[in-house]
């Protein structure tokens, strides 16, 4: 049966928590990704940014989960207007920022 949106979001949050807590070496070898605007369309924007990181097993599950939230197909090299222009940050910081934002959405009851 389909997973309720609240459960799906909670599972994504749990995965991001696990990534941040289990991080020993620099996440994804310190790869840089585009920073995104967290105010709207966060799932697709996050996926568009993270999909450009390849060969990083630590975030593969996150990429799959974000894909489940994003209603359209996302491929590498694709960028929407939600990207913060010319600002790149490390994947580890991107994950932390995304986690804070998603936890707030969950607490507010915004599951979709």
């Amino acid at each position: 049966s389909p997973v309720p949106p609240s459960t799906a979001l909670k599972e994504l949050i749990e995965e991001l928590v696990n990534i941040t807590q289990n991080q020993k070496a620099p996440l994804c070898n310190g790869s840089m990704v585009w920073s995104i605007n967290l105010t709207a369309g966060v799932y697709c924007a996050a996926l568009e940014s993270l999909i450009n990181v390849s060969g990083c097993s630590a975030i593969e599950k996150t990429q799959r989960m974000l894909n489940g939230f994003c209603p359209h197909k996302v491929s590498a090299g694709q960028f929407s207007s939600l990207r913060v222009r010319d600002t790149k940050i490390e994947v580890a910081q991107f994950v932390k920022d995304l986690l804070v934002h998603l936890k707030k959405l969950f607490r507010e009851g915004q599951f979709n």
Partner: antibody, heavy 123, light 107 residues
């Protein structure tokens, strides 16, 4: 030491508004990941969750009572206030406030409780 | 809302007995299950959170287990000070909901 202390009127008449205050000691509701819940327990009965407020002012209510409840915080006084409108004798209960901490995963577990304040609704 | 059903509603056991209390959720709560102990005339006290985690100061005789919809609180060796009502609570989905309670008495 973390403690919470509820205060209330003790006796309220039907149709009136009940105002309860929870004063927090040993922690601050301005600290990230802190939350405060209100729970009530009618005499001889079980526990019912009423409302929750997070450090960043995100508020959630029990849908069964949402239209009658308002939760707010005063960070400067380190207090959380709960208002319940249009009270009825069935609202007679001991009202507890409790602390929730959500570090990492978001789970709601109330790790410290106040001693409770008994509120009787009667004319 | 998620319904929480506790069993038994009351039990009587001897000092030193192993006691188990069950809690069933109406849907999967993914281990977000807490247990509270409430002694007569007192506020509830957190005993177990996230199915099996214990706050500091909780005696080792208390343990929690379970997954999905079914959870258990175990007191490995009942002590006189354990006379109380025990409540389960799901912390997965709002509104938060509690079981009806299990009253534990000494024979």
């Amino acid at each position: 030491e973390v403690t919470l202390r509820e205060s209330g009127p003790g006796l309220v008449k039907p149709t009136q508004t009940l105002t309860l205050t929870c004063t927090l000691y040993g922690f601050s509701l301005s600290t990230s990941d802190m939350g405060v819940d209100w729970i009530r327990q009618p005499p001889g009965k079980g526990l019912e969750w009423l409302a929750h407020i997070w450090w960043d002012d995100v508020k959630r209510y029990n849908p069964a009572l949402k239209s009658r409840l308002t939760i707010s915080k005063d960070t400067s006084k380190n207090q959380v206030v709960l208002k319940l409108t249009s009270v009825d004798p069935v609202d007679t209960a001991t009202y507890y406030c409790a602390r929730t901490v959500s570090s990492g995963y978001i789970y709601y577990a109330m790790d410290y409780w106040g001693q409770g304040t008994l509120v009787t609704v009667s004319s | 809302d998620i319904q929480m059903t506790q069993s038994p509603s009351s039990l009587s056991a001897s000092v030193g007995d192993r006691v188990t209390i069950s809690c069933r959720a109406s849907q999967d709560i993914r281990n977000y299950l807490n247990w509270y102990q409430q002694k007569p005339g007192k506020a509830p006290k957190l005993l177990i959170f996230y199915t099996s985690m214990k706050p500091r100061g909780v005696p080792s005789r208390f343990s929690g287990s379970g997954s999905g919809t079914d959870y258990t609180l175990t007191i490995s060796s009942l002590q006189p000070e354990d006379i109380a009502t025990y409540y389960c609570q799901q912390g997965n989905t709002l509104p938060l909901t509690f079981g009806g309670g299990t009253k534990v008495e000494i024979k």
